[in-house]
């Protein structure tokens, strides 16, 4: 089995020819002994050891000796340059045929079949694995929400999928799967996904099955996820050097005295699996996932924590029914640290 990737340049074929006596044959000298190889066009003869033993046209002829003596043994090492293996190549077949002018009637051709496992190369990376966010203010019920700004602070994860180099041309689909922390274990919202956009040669939305993206049909914000009020504007986090200082949060002020982690692996969060097909393009594809921290859940259930960390996973994989095409899954984590907004408690009034 050939584990083939584009890094494979040479293929070495080792052939042992012997003329030994057997119970049927006494093992005479073989005159004009010749080995003929018929190779596919994907393989180009590169070198032979011993040097000069073989000549190549469409077929490769290797002179073994005249005569090839009784009890003689010969090893041929033939190197091929791999020039034409594609995703469509299922196997490479080389036919070997021994011949001699001496009498031997059982020299059947031998077929060597090399199954090709074609390994695709691609990559998955993120602009920022860990985001910073916050919760605070007052609880708002679903029924009172009109726009995604009503939900909570914005999150934007950006995934980059490297080009494959060789197009799949209908042989499979590259898929980005997200294990998305959707709800906390009691069933309340956790990170509310608002939109997923794929940017390759053009941009289009990704809508995984199950109606799980913005299921409340809240109005999406204007480009740039513009905050809706001056109070929120001050707290909007902009890693790209936005206006004003970052929010003063309890976690920052108290060095994250009390933290908790919500992840699906521990059962403290419940995940949904969101899949987006990645276009077969020779360029880097960007996948942007926008979401909102569900503020009310954090106020109701996590108010005693200065910081809540939420973890998720993304996996890039190949979906194909062709067993000879492989791609190593690429997995990466993403997370968000959600800090409690600092509320300075005034000392109780002394009567």
């Amino acid at each position: 089995r050939l584990q083939y990737s584009r890094d494979v340049r040479k293929l070495l074929l080792s052939i042992n020819v012997t003329n030994t006596r057997t119970s049927e044959r006494s093992g005479e000298d073989a005159h004009e002994a010749l080995l003929t190889l018929v190779v596919p066009p994907a393989l180009l003869l590169s070198s032979v050891r011993p040097p000069g033993a073989c000549q190549a046209n469409e077929t490769i002829f290797c002179e073994l000796g005249n005569p090839f003596k009784r009890n003689q043994r010969m090893e041929l090492l033939i190197a091929f340059e791999v020039i034409g293996v594609t995703l469509h190549t299922r196997d490479l077949q080389v036919q070997l045929q021994l011949s001699t002018s001496s009498h031997q009637d059982n020299l059947w051709p031998m077929i060597l079949t090399l199954l090709v496992d074609y390994t695709l190369q691609t990559s998955l990376s993120m602009v920022n694995h860990r985001l910073q966010s916050f919760f605070g203010g007052t609880v708002m019920g679903e029924s009172g929400m009109k726009t995604v700004e009503d939900v909570g602070s914005p999150l934007k994860y950006e995934f980059q999928v490297g080009p494959m180099g060789e197009g799949l041309v209908g042989l499979g689909t590259l898929v980005l799967g997200l294990e998305w922390p959707y709800e906390v274990s009691n069933g309340k919202w956790l990170l509310y996904p608002t939109e997923i956009t794929v940017h390759g040669n053009g941009s289009w939305p990704c809508r995984p099955p199950g109606d799980l993206i913005n299921p409340l049909n809240l109005t999406l914000s204007d480009p740039g996820d513009r905050p809706s009020s001056p109070q929120r504007r001050r707290r909007q986090l902009d890693p790209g050097g936005g206006q004003g200082p970052p929010p003063v949060t309890l976690a920052a002020a108290k060095k994250a005295k009390s933290e908790t982690v919500l992840t699906c692996a521990t059962g403290r969060a419940h995940c949904v699996w969101l899949e987006c097909p990645i276009p077969d393009a020779p360029v880097v594809t960007n996948v942007t996932v926008k979401a909102r921290v569900w503020n009310s859940t954090f106020i109701e259930d996590y108010r005693d924590f200065d910081r809540v960390r939420v973890n998720g996973w993304a996996t890039l994989f190949l979906r194909t029914s062709i067993p000879t095409i492989n791609m190593e899954n690429k997995t990466t984590w993403f997370s968000v640290d959600i800090d409690s907004e600092l509320v300075e408690e005034l000392p109780a009034e002394i009567e």
Epitope: N186, G187, W189, Y192, P208, P209, C271, V272
Partner: nanobody, 120 residues
């Protein structure tokens, strides 16, 4: 209003298997999540497994690898396939359905439950 009816409970020996069914009728909302919970005598009701309308599943650590939740959307039915049962799996198994994002205990619809007893 959604009604849920569980079936398939019973007495089974440790190491055995059972398949619970939960049939939903009435007006189902979408997207939804259906789940199985269980309650042993004197204990609180605890999460076992859930399945979202998109097919995503989650399991409690104690049942991972032994239990499988499946849904048949055409029949509005969710199943819990339980294998390698242990005495500690004994309890009343409840089916529940809710809108995504809502608390199970505040907003979920619940069935009457089906008793599962695993003897050693």
């Amino acid at each position: 209003e959604v009604q849920l009816v569980e079936s398939g409970g019973g007495l089974v020996q440790a190491g055995g298997s059972l398949r619970l069914s939960c049939a939903a009728s009435g007006r189902m909302f979408s997207p939804n999540v259906m789940g199985w919970f269980r309650q042993a005598p004197g204990d609180q009701r605890e999460f076992v497994a859930n399945i979202y309308s998109g097919g995503s599943t989650n399991y409690a650590d104690t049942v991972k690898g032994r239990f499988t939740i499946l849904s048949d959307n055409a029949k509005n039915t969710v199943y819990l396939q339980m294998t390698s049962l242990k005495p500690e799996d004994t309890g009343v198994y409840y089916c529940s359905v809710k809108r995504v994002g809502q608390s199970w205990f505040d907003s979920g619809y619940w069935g009457q439950g089906t008793q599962v007893t695993v003897s050693s």
